[in-house]
Interface confidence: medium
């Protein structure tokens, strides 16, 4: 399977909420012994590979934000830790996987990565990730609501399957 990023750039005004989204593409094994570990983190556009560096989102690590569920299940983070930081990650039955960030500040600007690990019986090494940019703006040039820019088909399909 692969991960697609429907939008490569989100431009939002300060104080707004935004939901960043990734989507699982291709055949997803829904066997009873297959589960998925999904998470989000901040990164930088590294020279070697985007998303190789895993930095916290609002002081929460990828570990704090992860979901672990069966291939046929929906899930979301319900723990207080994430919600206290204005964050919630969620996954639906259709392969959509998102993180919602509330009350954006300029400090939230940067590169965000979603990551999916397929776990088979023990732990599979099948990892895929997607990247997108968030720009938080303030002042008279800031949009009134979030503006999203679709990924080109090449960007969307060119996500790594490690």
């Amino acid at each position: 399977f692969k991960v697609a990023t429907p939008y490569s750039l989100y431009v939002c005004p300060e104080g707004q909420n935004v939901t960043l989204t990734c989507r699982l593409l291709g055949p997803v094994d829904k066997g009873h012994d297959v589960t998925f570990y999904k998470t989000w983190y901040r990164s930088s556009r590294g020279e070697v590979q985007t998303c190789s560096e895993r930095r916290p989102i609002r002081n929460l690590t990828f570990q704090d934000l992860h979901l672990h569920h069966g291939g046929h299940q929906a899930a979301n983070t319900s723990h207080d830790l994430a919600q206290r930081h204005g964050l919630e990650s969620a996954s639906d039955h259709h392969g959509n996987f998102s993180i919602t960030m509330r009350n954006l500040t300029l400090l939230d600007s940067g590169l965000y990565c979603c990551l999916v690990v397929e776990i088979r019986h023990h732990h599979s090494e099948h990892r895929v990730h997607g990247a997108m940019e968030l720009q938080v703006q303030t002042g008279k040039d800031a949009p009134s609501n979030c503006v999203v820019y679709p990924s080109s088909s090449q960007d969307s399909e060119n996500i790594t399957a490690a």
Epitope: Y37, L81, H123
Partner: antibody, heavy 118, light 104 residues
Amino acid sequence: EVQLVESGGGLVQPGGSLRLSCAASGFTFSSYTMSWVRQAPGKGLEWVATISNSGSYTYYLDSVKGRFTISRDNAKNSLYLQMNSLRAEDTAVYYCARDTVLSPFDYWGQGTTVTVSS
Amino acid sequence: EIVLTQSPDFQSVTPKEKVTITCSATSSISYMHWYQQKPDQSPKLLIKDTSELASGVPSRFSGSGSGTDFTLTINSLEAEDAATYYCHQRSSFTFGQGTKLEIK
């Protein structure tokens, strides 16, 4: 500081049972997958079992499946390994290890010794 | 199950020497991880994801490889590096048999 402290090891006869415990501190225990890894005397490392952060998913080494049960109590920051029908080949030091799925076992306890002998 | 075979099983080396430990897998894998275990101590994560040093690990350690062949290298060995080193992969959670490094 991340700390993992195992307890519950000891001498047990073949066919007997033991329950190992691992007390975790210094990190958000409920966010982490946890595992047990063992090391027989003078031998290498062997993974035994893994449990997801919520406890919903468990994974076992084939030779312990049906005999060992991994569990956790997130309210108590504790990991457990219930070992039944013990065999001589289960004799080992048992380590609990933190497991981030993305990274391998990044922190280990000091180990607790299980000896199965008549 | 993927089997990992390390080479050599044992090596006696002098300080400042360069040491190379190899780990060969029976099937192709994406990432290899390495642990160091000193006598009467718990294992310690050394390298994750083939080449990324774990926190606090000296830069004389490095990892490389892909597919079925992976390498742990210690440049300019120090006395404190006397230990057993294990490779590890997560597709079926297996470890190599270990390589014991003795300092002359």
